[in-house]
């Protein structure tokens, strides 16, 4: 039975040219996390494995860097990356977890953070 | 230089047994999960079993299920498949594949060979 | 288990044409999705894997798109050395499945 919950950052929102920190924690299960995956709609960002350390696509390794943690650091921020991120938690024995993470990146310097959210 | 060497083919009889086995060397192997996939004669691709690194859980495909088993030994650096009940249609190339991350195949070894006829 | 339909199934083309091979799958994949080359005899050779994001050491004339149920393997100028059998496959679940191949040869 998967016991589990992902708190994410929620919706948030970053200035054009900025950066952004994606943060997903998994709680409330024992399970191992064997992989952590960070996907924008369709398109694989990074990959980070218990043992190999993290992947990320060649095509964001610009503009993407691991962390902190499990998390990812989007940079240089622009208004094509505004939409859905998912981070998605392979454990063992539970299964796999997923939380999703609404980004807006904004033209002003008006920028705000949303609230944080779970999804069991 | 990443390099995955089959071994343990050859002709067996319908029923019959065989082990192939694949030794790994140029990498951290006990960090990666691991595939079978085979090639019929003149045929396309088949995956037939995986078994991941980090819980060591394996995979089968169903027509092999049963009578196939993967493991692996992190101290020797090598992964086998035991293959019991062969049938004609399993007569094959059996390559061993490396799958970082799961999600793709980047390293595969040469093939060895399994015939099944009596 | 996911279906995963090539076509062509074989194609001719000359040296410096552009070839473009389709995958379909019988159920949505999101980016798990691998192309391979194989040429007689040999093993298969990872170009592309999840969907778009070429393999280090592989020619830039070779690259992957699409996402879902669609994808595309699509070679700029044809060399050479790319007669070969090309064949997509599904990571997303177990069972992995192939492609059934497209056969590239000379015009």
């Known amino acids: 039975m998967m016991t589990g919950t992902i708190e994410t950052t929620g919706n948030i929102s970053a200035e054009k040219g900025g950066s952004i920190i994606l943060q997903c924690h998994l709680s409330s299960t024992t399970a191992q996390v064997t992989q952590v995956n960070w996907e924008q709609q369709d398109q694989l960002l990074a990959i980070c494995n218990a043992d190999l350390g993290w992947h990320i696509s060649p095509s964001f390794k610009d503009r993407v860097a691991p962390g902190p943690g499990l998390g990812l650091t989007l940079q240089s921020l622009t208004v094509n990356d505004t939409g859905e991120y998912f981070c998605i938690y392979h454990t063992y024995p539970d299964g796999t977890y997923t939380g999703r993470i609404f980004l807006e990146v904004l033209e002003s310097s008006v920028a705000e953070h949303g609230a944080r959210f779970q999804i069991p | 230089e990443v390099q995955l060497l089959e071994s343990g083919g050859g002709l067996v009889q319908p029923g019959g047994s065989l082990r192939l086995s694949c030794a790994a060397s140029g990498f951290t192997f006990s960090s990666y999960s691991m595939s079978w996939v085979r090639q019929a004669p003149g045929k396309g691709l088949e995956w037939v079993s995986s078994?991941?690194?980090?819980?060591?859980?394996?995979y089968y495909a169903d027509s092999v299920k049963g009578r196939f088993t993967i493991s692996r030994d992190n101290s020797k650096n090598t992964l086998y498949l035991q293959m019991n009940s062969l049938r004609a249609e399993d007569t094959a190339v059996y390559y061993c594949?490396?799958?970082?991350?799961?999600?793709?195949?980047?390293?595969w070894g040469q093939g060895t060979l399994v015939t099944v006829s009596s | 288990d996911i279906q995963m339909t090539q076509s062509p199934s074989s194609l001719s083309a000359s040296v410096g044409d552009r070839v473009t091979i389709t995958c379909r799958a019988s159920?949505?994949?999101?980016?798990?999705l691998n192309w391979y080359q194989q040429k007689p005899g040999k093993a298969p050779k990872l170009l592309i894997y999840?969907?778009?994001s070429l393999q280090s050491g592989v020619p830039s004339r070779f690259s992957g798109s699409g996402s879902g149920t669609d994808f595309t393997l699509t070679i700029s100028s044809l060399q050479p050395e790319d007669f070969a059998t090309y064949y997509c496959?599904?990571?997303?679940?177990?069972?992995?499945?192939f492609g059934g191949g497209t056969k590239v040869e000379i015009k």
């Open positions: 594949a490396r799958e970082p991350y799961d999600v793709w195949m980047d390293y």
């Open positions: 999840a969907a778009s």
């Open positions: 159920q949505s994949i999101s980016y798990y």
């Open positions: 078994i991941s690194s980090n819980t060591g859980t394996s």
């Open positions: 496959q599904q990571s997303y679940s177990t069972p992995l499945t």
